[in-house]
Interface confidence: medium
């Protein structure tokens, strides 16, 4: 029985050239997190493995930094970074929890953070 929920930063926006922190938080479960994946649509950004630590995909090494915590920091943002991002928590004994964040990278300096929301 999967009882947990993932809280994410929801729909967020940031300025071109700036940076943004993608954060997910797994709550309402005592399951042990064994690995967290960060994926952008059909690309793997990074993995945080409980045993092996962080692995950043080579194509993102220059612009992606691990943390804070199990989150991910995207730097030197471009308009092409706009899109869906997924945090996938592999847990024991619950299984896999997935959270979704939508990032919009804006040309202007008007970039406001969206409200937090929960994904069951």
């Amino acid at each position: 029985m999967m009882t947990g929920t993932i809280e994410t930063t929801g729909n967020i926006s940031a300025e071109k050239g700036g940076s943004i922190i993608l954060q997910c938080h797994l709550s309402s479960t005592t399951a042990q997190v064994t690995q967290v994946n960060w994926e952008q649509q059909d690309q793997l950004l990074a993995i945080c493995n409980a045993d092996l630590g962080w692995h950043i995909s080579p194509s993102f090494k220059d612009r992606v930094a691990p943390g804070p915590g199990l989150g991910l920091t995207l730097q030197s943002l471009t308009v092409n970074d706009t899109g869906e991002y997924f945090c996938i928590y592999h847990t024991y004994p619950d299984g896999t929890y997935t959270g979704r964040i939508f990032l919009e990278v804006l040309e202007s300096s008007v970039a406001e953070h969206g409200a937090r929301f929960q994904i069951p």
Epitope: T34, Y92, R100
Partner: antibody
């Protein structure tokens, strides 16, 4: 090259147990789930369950919950499936298969062992 | 459990023609824009081989003659054109929720 090498065929008596091994090589053992799949003669495939090598965490098909025990030995990159209280219905080929912990690949089982034939007979 | 039904159970197709295999799930296997359905090929005495993952993605090394389509509950594997080496049994499998389940298989015969 990814390889999943399973132990050889087994002839066992009803009521006994069998333990099948699956030794992985050519990839990072902890980056993949290991699954076990049953195929009775001339029949389709049945998913028995999976084990997460990171911590030995398991998820079972309820049908096999009291029949199969899945374990891993990280030090030797080997997964094991013990099948208990065997009956003639358990005579089948059993496969191990790995799936990367990647949502973008849908956790599909992209590498398979060669299969281990288990025959239950008195 | 999600029940996966394949049709037809067997299929005979002439060399060079198109083969179409259907797969239906008893409930949606979609999650966040991905369809968690995969296709495998199995030849006698061999383990299954992954052909298509996430409904439509061709596994590395698999010929482009194979393609997959569909979403939610209805999926299709197409082989066009069929070659002699394609004679095998094909299975679809869902893993949107536990337990992972397979279709009953479709045996493809080449005429």
């Amino acid at each position: 090259e990814v390889q999943l090498q399973q132990s050889g065929p087994d002839l066992v008596k009803p009521g006994a147990s069998v333990k099948i091994s699956c030794k992985a090589s050519g990839y990072s053992f902890t980056g993949y789930y290991m699954h076990w799949v049953k195929q009775s003669h001339g029949k389709s495939l049945e998913w028995i369950g999976r084990v997460n090598p990171n911590n030995g965490g398991t998820s079972y098909n309820q049908k096999f919950k009291d029949k199969a025990v899945l374990t891993v030995d990280k030090s030797s990159s080997t997964a094991y499936m013990e099948f208990r209280s065997l009956t003639s219905e358990d005579s089948a080929v059993y496969y191990c298969a790995s799936s990367p912990l990647l949502r973008l690949r849908g956790y599909a089982m992209d590498d398979w062992g060669q299969g281990t034939s288990v025959t239950v007979s008195s | 459990d999600i029940v996966v039904t394949q049709s037809p159970a067997s299929l005979a197709v002439s060399l060079g023609q198109r083969a179409t295999i259907s797969c239906r799930a008893s409930e949606s296997v979609d999650s966040y824009g991905k369809s968690f359905i995969h296709w495998y090929q199995q030849k006698p005495g061999q383990p299954p081989k992954l052909l298509i993952y996430v409904a439509s993605n061709l596994e590395s090394g698999v010929p482009a003659r194979f393609s997959g389509s569909g979403s939610r509950t209805d999926f299709t594997l197409t082989i066009d054109p069929v070659e002699a080496d394609d004679a095998a049994t094909y299975y679809c499998q869902q893993n949107n929720e536990d337990p992972w389940t397979f279709g009953g298989g479709t045996k493809l015969e080449i005429k």
